[in-house]
């Protein structure tokens, strides 16, 4: 069962997210899944104690990205 809205999280989250903290939003299937099932590290919410993990293939935002571009977890499409 889909969980209720939680909070707004950054510019990639205009809609409330249905994901609990241990889950991330899968844009392709449009529901929450365990974060470990997705390849790409999700940046942490603003105010987190350490920077988001990045891999060699996870680019830095170089153009047009504001703070909190994509926060963990991604928003649900309600």
């Amino acid at each position: 069962m889909r969980r209720g809205p939680r909070s707004l999280r950054g510019r990639d989250a205009p809609a409330p997210t249905p994901c609990v903290p241990a889950e991330c939003f899968d844009l392709l299937v449009r529901h929450c899944v365990a974060c470990g099932l997705l390849r790409t590290p999700r940046p942490k919410p603003a105010g987190a104690s350490s920077p988001a993990p990045r891999t060699a293939l996870q680019p830095q935002e170089s153009v047009g990205a504001g703070a909190g571009e994509a926060a963990l977890p991604l928003p649900g499409l309600l």
Partner: antibody, heavy 118, light 113 residues
Amino acid sequence: EVQLVESGGGLVQPGGSLRLSCAASGDSITSGYWNWVRQAPGKGLEWVGYISYSGSTYYNPSLKSRFTISRDTSKNTFYLQMNSLRAEDTAVYYCAGLNDLYLYFDVWGQGTLVTVSS
Amino acid sequence: DIQMTQSPSSLSASVGDRVTITCRSSQSLVHSNGNTYLHWYQQKPGKAPKLLIYKVSNRFSGVPSRFSGSGSGTDFTLTISSLQPEDFATYYCSQSTHVPPFTFGQGTKVEIK
């Protein structure tokens, strides 16, 4: 660093079958979405389909159910089984990993050429 | 499916020229989450494509600053501010807002004048 290596391409007669392999290193295919993209000679890119972390698949509807994507997690390899091949399936076939945060293909194999001809 | 149309199909330019490639989609690429998943790839003969620009205007890591992307809705542009010898290649736009299927433009070949 993530690397993808394709194999299995070659010459096949019309109506024949071929299985391509894509071996992944540096990342597990039990996470994310793993794709096949093809390119006919002198033409553009066409997405074929993907297999997801759960093993679920989705295909380009234009391929009329002739292609099947599968995986062997013990080998960290995924496959493209192509049946009832036609001349228009002649192409370089690339495997590619998807950045599932921003939805772009961030890692590509070197490509393998499939030629369908009698 | 979303159709992606690039123009021109090919162009001839000289080193140092400013080059602009346009891409138009058959419907808006604004996702319901507010993002626009329009990307640009560069491909050289015999090689796999490489990502240049993601989400309209974000340069991928290692991509020179002479490459820039802009646009919104259905109309997008890739600009090379000062063409370099290594930029002669084919460029593809791609959308992943309405997926699957992922779709690509037909490509724009940038040739030496």
